[in-house]
């Protein structure tokens, strides 16, 4: 029959070439002379001439060594023709399979592989995967089947073999416990890939395993005891810098320190922050310290990390003895702001009050007093006793200096320390009203018609306070009552002025006496302009003459 079984040819054959592979034979050769030929890639098309056929015998010839990794299978066609060139058979498919030889070593995909694993992990933890390829066949033979192994480990600490590798996948895993970044931050593994499933050619590469930091080291105070001196009353004052050492990776959360005052700060006087570069604990005063109340504080500060510890670790504690230094403190007026009620208009030399300061310092310092600000110049202060007396007339109604009945004075106390210090106090004099002002009408100029005149309503004001104000009483004096009437309204806060007799157009003085509830009398002259007109008027029509 005009058929041929697939032909297997090993690659890298040593010849001699041409090498006979198989004979094509048509049973039509009994009847006529047959000529054989082949076509296809490897015969008459690229790569041409790899195969040939003996024209008359039908022997299929291999002309040179094959390379499976280049072409693993050739598909040719065999042809049989008679002498006259007529085809005596259908073209026959010829499959030539190139069988593999182990002619390639494995190749790692990288010269150096890099991976990482957290320190302190359990065995079995995967680290990384390495890969090697082999061009040889791994399906029908072991030629391209790669087995991985670890040849060596550096350093060999704490165990010779800290890692192992999956022989088929190349996955590197931890096999021994004791990975400690602080002792060995990096391992270098020489890895091997061997074909023939571990029995063939070997190639090597390097796997570098970085050991990642875990917070397995506590920060430790160095030193653990501190002594500091702080002036009293200083706020935000740097008391002490506390130094810690931490074996974990610098500038990582496992290294950065967190400080906590554990004890000794009952009054919440201190605060501690972490310096971003040095990692030191900066102890500062949150509030001023008082030498006279407590001249020494013993603080206990604990340090941890920003990151939690991965295992139970003892925390380090520092002791800081803070000595408070005495400073000359300013005298303090008691109270800082003193309210005193005093009657306005008291006689000069009359005592107003005694206003004194206390010195926080324990020494018996002498305090002297003086007035710092007395806008109206109404007061004097005894430098020794702090006695405040009137030297001017206290006037409640003085709107320039008195606001809401209060006259504000600032006083100063100075001790005799070296250097001396001063403190200020505020004296708020609440001026008690006296009936020192009579009522006055508003307005004091009116314009009125001499025919059917409109009543003129004047508001009454009194600078004093009740009860030295309304109800008011009105009385006309100096014969003004001949032409005019003056009546106080029911509420007693306005006076109604009426023209009761005809007056020719002119300007007249109306003498009005007003008295308040305390009978304080005030005479006021009202200038009345009388116009020739009827009813209501604001200005006189036409010319008029004064008189």
């Amino acid at each position: 029959d005009w058929v041929v079984a697939p032909i297997s040819v090993p690659e890298n054959g040593k010849g001699p070439f041409p090498q006979r592979l198989n004979q094509l034979k048509s049973n039509k050769d009994r009847d006529t002379k047959i000529f054989y030929s082949i076509t296809g890639p490897g015969a008459d098309s690229p790569p041409e001439g790899v195969f040939a056929v003996e024209k008359e015998t039908g022997w299929l010839l291999l002309n040179k060594p094959l390379d499976r990794e280049e072409i693993a299978k050739y598909e040719l066609f065999g042809h049989a023709v008679s002498e006259n060139g007529a085809s005596v058979e259908d073209p026959m498919n010829i499959s030539i399979i190139v069988t593999d030889q182990n002619d390639h070593k494995p190749k790692f995909t990288q010269d150096t592989f890099r991976g990482s694993v957290l320190e302190g992990v359990l065995p079995g933890t995967s680290v990384m995967q390495v890969t090697a390829t082999d061009e040889d066949d791994a399906i029908y033979t072991y030629n391209g089947v790669v087995a991985y192994s670890i040849h060596s480990q550096e350093p060999k600490d704490p165990h010779d073999l800290m890692f192992t590798i999956h022989r088929s996948t190349g996955t590197i895993s931890v096999i021994s416990s004791g990975l400690d970044r602080e002792k060995v931050p990096e391992y270098t593994l020489t890895i091997q890939a061997t074909d023939m499933d571990g029995d063939g050619s070997t190639t090597t590469a390097v796997a570098v395993v970085e050991i990642l930091d875990a917070n397995d080291n506590a920060p430790m105070f160095d030193p653990q005891k501190y002594e500091a001196h702080v002036p009293e009353n200083a706020v935000g004052h740097e008391v002490q810098r506390l130094t810690v050492t931490d074996l974990d990776a610098p500038n990582s959360p496992a290294w950065r320190a967190t400080y906590l005052i554990m004890g000794g700060d009952d009054g919440d006087h201190f605060t501690i922050t972490t310096h971003p570069e040095s990692n030191q604990g900066i102890l500062t005063t949150r509030k001023g310290l008082d030498f006279e109340a407590k001249n020494q504080h013993t603080l206990y500060v604990e340090v941890t990390n920003e990151a939690p510890f991965v295992l139970k670790l003892p925390t380090s504690t520092a002791t800081i003895v803070v000595h408070v230094e005495d400073v000359n403190e300013a005298p303090v007026f008691v109270p800082p702001s003193k309210v005193v009620e005093v009657q306005e208009g008291i006689p000069t030399g009359e005592p107003v009050c005694v206003y004194t300061a206390e010195d926080p310092d324990k020494e018996n310092q002498k305090i002297s007093y003086r007035i710092l600000r007395d806008p109206a110049g109404w007061l004097a202060m005894d430098p020794d006793s702090g006695q405040v007396t009137a030297v001017g007339t206290l006037d409640r109604e003085d709107e320039q200096f008195v606001r809401n009945n209060i006259y504000e004075v600032m006083v100063l106390a100075m001790d005799n320390g070296s250097p001396p210090t001063t403190g200020t106090g505020t004296l708020l004099l609440t001026l008690i009203d006296v009936n020192d002002h009579g009522p006055v009408p508003e307005p004091r100029q009116i314009t009125i018609c001499n025919q059917s005149p409109v009543r003129q309503v004047l508001n009454i004001t009194d600078k004093d306070l009740s009860p030295h104000t309304s109800p008011f009483q009105a009385q006309l004096t100096d014969d003004s009552d001949i032409y005019w009437t003056a009546e106080v309204n029911e509420e007693g806060d306005t006076v109604v002025l009426s023209l009761k007799k005809f007056l020719k157009q002119d300007t007249y003085d109306v003498h009005l006496s007003l008295s308040d509830h305390g009978n304080k009398e005030q005479l006021t002259v009202i200038r009345a302009t009388v116009c020739d007109c009827h009813g209501h008027v604001e200005t006189c029509p036409g010319p008029w003459k004064g008189g």
Partner: antibody, heavy 117, light 111 residues
Framework: EVQLLESGGGLVQPGGSLRLSCAAS????????MSWVRQAPGKGLEWVSA????????YYADSVKGRFTISRDNSKNTLYLQMNSLRAEDTAVYYC??????????WGQGTMVTVSS | QSALTQPASVSGSPGQSITISCTGT?????????VSWYQQHPGKAPKLILS???KRPSGVSNRFSGSKSGNTASLSISGLQAEDEADYYC???????????FGGGTKLTVL
């Protein structure tokens, strides 16, 4: 001589607690992962729990997860197993063993834990 | 159900040789050369007799030997002696947690 010595076993009622200890000597304790392996009467070896050399990583079998706690004190060269909410099926001989990097060696002599009412 | 498969029992006469198999997968026995064997006498703790497939710790008789082919490891004991009667457990390293798998154990009887 490399040695492990367990203690703390005994009879306990279901729901009760026990704490096992394993004292190590003769090797650098902190460099080795340690494990607890138990063996129920007439049965095979069952891995219960493990802890890394530093104590930072732990492993528990599903059968004991949430009930048992493994810990170690490297300053005292001692391994512990705190067993809570004990059940009848926890009855076994408990061995501590050091993982040598591919195998367990040495093993302690074992301590018997019996959970029964 | 143990992760590694061992025969429940084997037996042999004094002087004979026996082999105990331990079958795993391509991710444990087949993947790593970290197969170990432990001997346990009744009432005693397990004792390591082979590590890394075939390495004997000091003090272990050379009658014990180990081998591995594919996913199966084997323990061979030659010249059986009465004191060899014990339970034998295999174990293998595997990546992940748990990182060790135990066999179910094989009871060796010396007839």
């Amino acid at each position: 001589e490399v040695q492990l010595l367990e203690s703390g076993g005994g009879l306990v009622q279901p729901g009760g607690s026990l704490r096992l200890s394993c004292a190590a000597s003769g090797f650098t304790f902190s460099s080795y992962a340690m494990s607890w392996v138990r063996q129920a009467p007439g049965k095979g070896l069952e891995w219960v729990s493990a802890i890394s050399g530093s104590g930072g990583s732990t492993y528990y079998a599903d059968s004991v997860k949430g009930r048992f706690t493994i810990s170690r004190d490297n300053s005292k060269n001692t391994l512990y197993l705190q067993m809570n909410s004990l059940r009848a099926e926890d009855t076994a001989v408990y061995y501590c063993a050091s993982w040598g990097g591919g195998w367990f060696d040495p093993w302690g002599q074992g301590t018997m834990v019996t959970v029964s009412s | 159900q143990s992760a590694l498969t061992q025969p429940a029992s084997v037996s042999g006469s004094p002087g004979q040789s026996i082999t105990i198999s331990c079958t795993g997968t391509s991710n444990d026995v087949g993947a790593y050369n970290y197969v170990s064997w432990y001997q346990q006498h009744p009432g005693k703790a397990p004792k390591l007799i082979l590590s890394e497939v075939n390495k004997r710790p000091s003090g272990v008789s050379n009658r014990f030997s180990g081998s591995k082919s594919g996913n199966t490891a084997s323990l061979s004991i030659s010249g059986l002696q009465a004191e060899d009667e014990a339970d034998y457990y295999c174990s293998s390293f595997t990546s992940g947690l748990p990182w060790v798998l135990f066999g179910g154990g094989t009871k060796l009887t010396v007839l």
